[in-house]
Interface confidence: low
């Protein structure tokens, strides 16, 4: 007689897939042009990349530190009406793709919460929350929770409004903080709070550090849903070595919880890598006449139609990847154990009962490595085969598909793998 | 309230290194980039790089490329600005200076405010 | 890189005179998207760091004197001064933050005639 199935466990949206940050709405769409009604025209192109949610804004009226100029419930002007929002929910529903809307109310000013209103501040978000929830969001985020006194509570607060609401809303906090005691005592209070901290930024990026680094976290949470990015709001490439980016994909795509990026990671986009182009919110870069006043500024291979083109890049990479976590039983919802492998390597596995496996090797090292997989560290339930099939590598030059000994593995610099193999009774 | 404050004057031989700290307090020292300026004698204020305390990472001058290292210590709000295989002509007041307001931890606005009092460094045989 | 300059070197003005200040980018400074102008005014004192005065071309940093103005837009831009005090007396700098290197402009000092 076969094993019973496992039974599944309950799947909230927000844990099928990524979900995409777009914090200024007006460098995503690009120069000269950046409300809502332009935003519906990319929505073809969230969902090629399999995206499951957007987190878009701020959005609200606000006068740089001005409590009494800041209105959570009006959309400012300049990224169009009411209706322009309402049409885009309506249009990105249609398209499977739920919309977050970041509260933080003081946005453009100094302290994202005015230091010195915090209660006046915490009833408009209240109020916002129950309008935006009325409207049809799906969610809210709210950035720099360090800086607002008593987080725990309000946020707590915040929750209950939201999932009172529905259990199918979320609730997003973000925080520039990389301490895990800090990071652990924010969620306590909150049971389904999805938190976006620098956590991960805080790493010599090596495969033992950052190993340490994700196994402390699962452990200090406990088994609840997490989500993995570099920062709360920032671009991957702002924290990572150029050479990693790949295998921080990778990695984000694979770990056990919602990769959370921002709009340009897709495609390795910098911050202030072009001339003329203001630091702080770099302008996505959809083709080469993205920057029409420099020509010759930007290449193909840095846009999303060069990347489109291109089976070999970054953007390809981040789709295939995207597709995987969003359809494989193990990599939705399967158990995550790590084990010992060489040295600068960090290499897991994600198994959900009698699905197909998947094995992830990740060398952080600039120097190529044999794997050294050692499967003692594992229990029973997750032993490894002898061979193993490549779904894809971060580097050219390996054949997608074709089986793999895992005794003799051997990975090239910064070379991440994603190898499957069946459930073996 | 914000505030920068540096090392001490220090006075090198050419061809040494100087490493001058900025310990910052009054805010949350991982949620603004710290630049540095440089003013020679007499001169006008020279741009040489930032470093984003949040992850470490940084963006120089050309021109200060290969000579200036920046680096940060979250745990003493503290940054750090060497600069290399020094020469007559590195004589000036350095200054450290924080983004005048941010975001998020990369999206700033980089006007500076406020300044460290500048620390003067000397350059002779 | 952007250059900046600024005119003039330098100026003398009778306390209580309105005076100006220009200051040139080789290249916009303004972002379309935002259409703000990403352009910063700092005065200077002798044996003092600068100290901000203005920022986005227009806006005064609080705790600024309202003698103190800024314009502009663009490539083109003016600090001026309402009515000259005697603590006004000082090097002023223009700055653009527009893009990376971060540029400043050669300095105008300001004296009392």
């Known amino acids: 007689r076969a094993p019973r199935c496992r039974e599944l466990p309950a799947q909230k949206w927000w844990h099928t897939g990524a979900l995409y940050r777009i914090g200024d709405l007006q460098a995503f769409q690009g120069h000269g042009s950046g409300n809502l009604a332009g935003l519906k025209g990319r929505l073809d192109y969230l969902s090629s990349l399999k995206v499951k949610g957007l987190v878009l804004g701020p959005l609200h009226k606000n006068q740089k530190d001005d409590v009494a100029q800041t209105d959570l419930l009006q959309i400012d002007p300049n990224f169009g009406s009411k209706e322009d929002f309402d049409n885009l929910l309506q249009s990105a529903k249609k398209k499977s793709i739920r919309v977050i809307l970041d509260l933080t109310p003081n946005y453009r000013g100094e302290n994202l919460w005015f230091s010195t209103q915090v209660d006046s501040v915490a009833t408009k978000v209240k109020d916002a929350l129950e309008f935006w929830l009325q409207a049809g969001v799906d969610g809210f985020q709210v950035r720099d929770i360090e800086n607002l006194k008593d987080a725990s509570s309000f946020l707590a607060e915040w929750e209950n409004i939201t999932k009172g609401f529905s259990e199918d809303r979320l609730l997003i906090a973000g925080t520039n903080s990389s301490d895990l005691q800090q990071i652990v005592s924010l969620l306590e209070s909150n049971k389904d709070l999805l938190l976006t901290s620098s956590y991960l930024s805080d790493s010599s990026f090596t495969g033992e550090h950052t190993k340490s680094l994700v196994t402390q976290y699962l452990n200090a949470t406990g088994n609840r849903w997490c989500s993995w990015s570099l920062s709360q709001a920032g671009l991957l490439t702002s924290f990572l070595p150029a050479q990693l980016l790949r295998l921080y994909q990778l990695m984000l795509f694979t770990l056990p919880g919602t990769p959370v990026f921002s709009y340009g990671d897709e495609i390795g986009l910098k911050a202030a890598a072009l001339p003329g182009q203001p630091v702080e919110a770099p302008v996505m870069l959809w083709d080469e006449s993205s920057f029409p006043d420099i020509p010759g500024a930007v290449s193909a291979n840095m846009t999303v139609k060069g990347q489109s083109e291109d089976p070999g890049s970054l953007l390809s990479l981040f789709r295939q990847l995207s597709d995987q976590r969003s359809k494989e039983r193990s990599l939705l919802h399967g158990d995550f154990h790590t084990f010992s492998s060489g040295p600068g390597l960090f290499s897991y596995i994600r198994h959900w009962d009698q699905n197909e496996r998947f094995l992830v090797v990740l060398n952080f090292g600039d120097v190529g490595l044999s794997a050294g997989l050692q499967a003692s560290d594992l229990p029973a339930s997750a032993s490894l085969p002898t061979k193993a099939d490549l779904v894809l590598s971060t580097q050219p030059g390996r054949e997608e598909g074709s089986p793999l000994e895992l005794e003799r593995l051997k990975l090239e610099p910064h070379e991440g793998l994603l190898l499957r193999f069946p459930y073996v009774a | 309230q914000v505030q920068l404050v540096q090392s001490g004057a220090e006075v090198k031989k050419p061809g040494a290194s100087v490493k001058v700290s900025c310990k910052a307090s009054?805010?949350?020292?991982?949620?603004?980039?710290m630049h540095w300026v440089r003013q020679a004698p007499g001169q006008g204020l020279e741009w040489m790089g930032l470093?984003?305390?949040?992850?470490?990472?940084?963006s120089y001058a050309q021109k200060f490329q290969g000579r200036v290292t920046m680096t940060r210590d979250t745990s003493t709000s503290t940054v750090y600005m060497e600069l290399s295989s020094l020469r007559s002509e590195d004589t000036a007041v350095y200054y450290c200076?924080?983004?005048?307001?941010?975001?998020?931890?990369?999206?700033?606005?980089?006007?500076?405010?406020?300044w460290g009092q500048g620390t003067l460094v000397t350059v002779s045989s | 890189d952007i250059v900046m300059t600024q005119s003039p070197d330098s100026l003398a003005v009778s306390l209580g005179e309105r005076a100006t200040i220009n200051c040139k980018s080789s290249?916009?400074?303004?972002?379309?998207?935002?259409?703000?102008?990403?352009l910063a005014w700092y005065q200077q004192k002798p044996g003092q760091p600068p100290k901000l005065l203005i920022y986005?071309?227009?806006t005064r940093e609080s705790g600024v004197p309202d003698r103190f103005s800024g314009s502009g837009s663009g490539t083109d831009f003016t600090l001026t001064f309402s009515s000259l005090q005697a603590e006004d007396v000082a090097v002023y700098y223009c700055?653009?933050?527009?893009?990376?290197?971060?540029?400043f402009g050669p300095g105008t000092k300001v004296d009392i005639k």
């Open positions: 009054g805010y949350t020292f991982t949620s603004y980039y």
């Open positions: 700055q653009q933050y527009y893009s990376t290197p971060f540029t």
């Open positions: 470093i984003n305390p949040s992850g470490g990472s940084t």
């Open positions: 986005w071309a227009s």
């Open positions: 200076a924080r983004a005048g307001y941010c975001r998020s931890t990369t999206s700033c606005f980089n006007w500076f405010d406020p």
């Open positions: 290249q916009s400074v303004l972002y379309n998207s935002n259409n703000k102008n990403y």
